[in-house]
């Protein structure tokens, strides 16, 4: 628990350099995000494809979208889960991290030092061992997060099933209802290719209890979609006299010494350039 209060931001006096004052784990071990670069990568043949079960959510059901002052979060049902880890991990929520219109490079994880435009996190908890995400969040093996790197490109109708509701959650504390849809559509191609490491929550309290799966391949959203994400939301309540835009809500990459990130793929990308046959 924090030493006092739960006020933290991505900018200013309560920004990430101050997190560890109130949240000691933020200055501790196994911190995320990290830079994924060749020196720390090791192929692991035992990393088999994950199965995404119960991800196809019925549109007859309503799911709560919330502006929590740090991101936009979609609640997920507990019967949605990942198969293929040591335990069953049930979904609890997804949220995004992004930059700003002048510097649209707001992913949390980086690859060879390069940021992507944004990043999606689908958070799961160990439901074999713990009754809910809150209980699991500070326990060993408690959480598993799927991370999707997002780049600017073509329009993505699946991501728009979230983005089209942003106007109803403009301010902190506002909530809207989103029809269920197939969450698997938010994942990239070839989900069997991923990076795997043990790390932490990227936001306070930064518990070092997360099994990270970062998909190798990014998804694309359009420039307009990215701009909507970067401009639609505020960190502050509707009646706040000093509104703050919700931008640059990503943590800097953390030190990753004497540890490895395991990959489910061998390093060489297959060349598929046009003209080769």
């Amino acid at each position: 628990a924090p030493v006092n209060g739960s006020k933290w931001t991505y900018f200013g006096p309560d920004g990430e350099n101050s997190w560890s004052k109130k949240y000691p784990s933020c200055g501790g071990l196994l911190q995320s995000p990290i830079d994924l670069h060749s020196d720390i990568l090791q192929y692991d043949a035992s990393l088999t494809p994950l199965e995404f079960q119960g991800y196809n959510l019925s549109a007859n059901k309503q799911f709560l979208l919330t502006n929590n002052g740090h991101s936009v979060k979609l609640n997920l049902p507990s019967d949605m889960h990942i198969q293929g880890l040591q335990s069953r991990y049930s979904a609890t929520q997804l949220h995004l991290h992004w930059g700003n219109p002048n510097d649209p490079h707001g992913s949390e994880h980086t690859v060879s030092g390069q940021h992507f435009a944004a990043e999606l996190h689908i958070v799961h908890y160990n439901s074999d061992l713990y009754p809910d995400a809150s209980t699991a969040s500070n326990k060993s093996e408690g959480l598993a997060v799927l991370a999707v790197l997002i780049e600017m490109g073509s329009f993505n109708p699946s991501y728009d099933k979230i983005f089209s509701h942003l106007q109803h959650v403009k301010y902190k504390g506002q909530e809207a209802f989103v029809p269920g849809f197939n969450i698997e559509e938010l994942l990239p191609e070839r989900t069997a290719e991923y990076y795997r490491y043990r790390g932490s929550l990227t936001t306070p309290p930064c518990n070092p209890t997360v099994l990270w799966t970062v998909f190798r391949n990014p998804v694309q959203i359009s420039q307009e979609q990215l701009l909507a994400l970067e401009t639609a939301l505020y960190c502050t309540h509707m009646d706040d006299p000093s509104p703050r835009e919700m931008i640059n809500n990503f943590r800097q990459v953390q030190k990753f010494d004497e540890r490895l990130v395991y990959t489910s793929f061998s390093q060489v990308q297959v060349c598929t350039a046009a003209g080769l046959s």
Partner: antibody, heavy 121, light 106 residues
Amino acid sequence: EVQLVESGGGLVQPGGSLRLSCAASGYSYTDYNIYWVRQAPGKGLEWVGYIDPANGDTTYNQKFKGRATISVDKSKNTAYLQMNSLRAEDTAVYYCSRPIYYGAYWYFDVWGQGTLVTVSS
Amino acid sequence: DIQMTQSPSSLSASVGDRVTITCRASSSVTYMHWYQQKPGKAPKPWIYGTSRLVSGVPSRFSGSGSGTDFTLTISSLQPEDFATYYCQQWSSNPLTFGQGTKVEIK
């Protein structure tokens, strides 16, 4: 025929609690959320909360958080509303309802007949 | 919370009259639903998605509007239309209803 039937209403002492039931029939029970909506005498409709019968996940109107608990028994196709610390203002007809998604919109297509709860000493 | 204000709260009209009920939301909503309720009965879905009539609802009913202002119109009031009508939004949590408009016989 799709049907929702509420029961469990009646006279309750102030400070007491109630447990209402909503039995569903005529459709695949876990495919739709079940909502509780109440209507005070001569007043409008007020949403209390809902449950996803497939997994028991609940969402509440903030106004009722901590005082209302919605649960489900899948084997009986029945949802329950428990409300504690009742006061006179909780006197109302309590309805359960099912929303359907049709042509990009939800609406409450099926309602129970309602059950009257009177809070009085 | 999005407050829904219906006007008028009640009206008296004669059979054959054109009747318009307004629902104003305190913040913009994507679409509006309307329900009809008769005394001692549960509400019935009437109009969904602002303008789509639920199956079985007579074509003399129509709905329109966008943003914060929505209307339900009955082009030629019939005896079976005397009831209370409620608007409802589903854009924001909590979902909210209007306080109702009672349509009475003059």
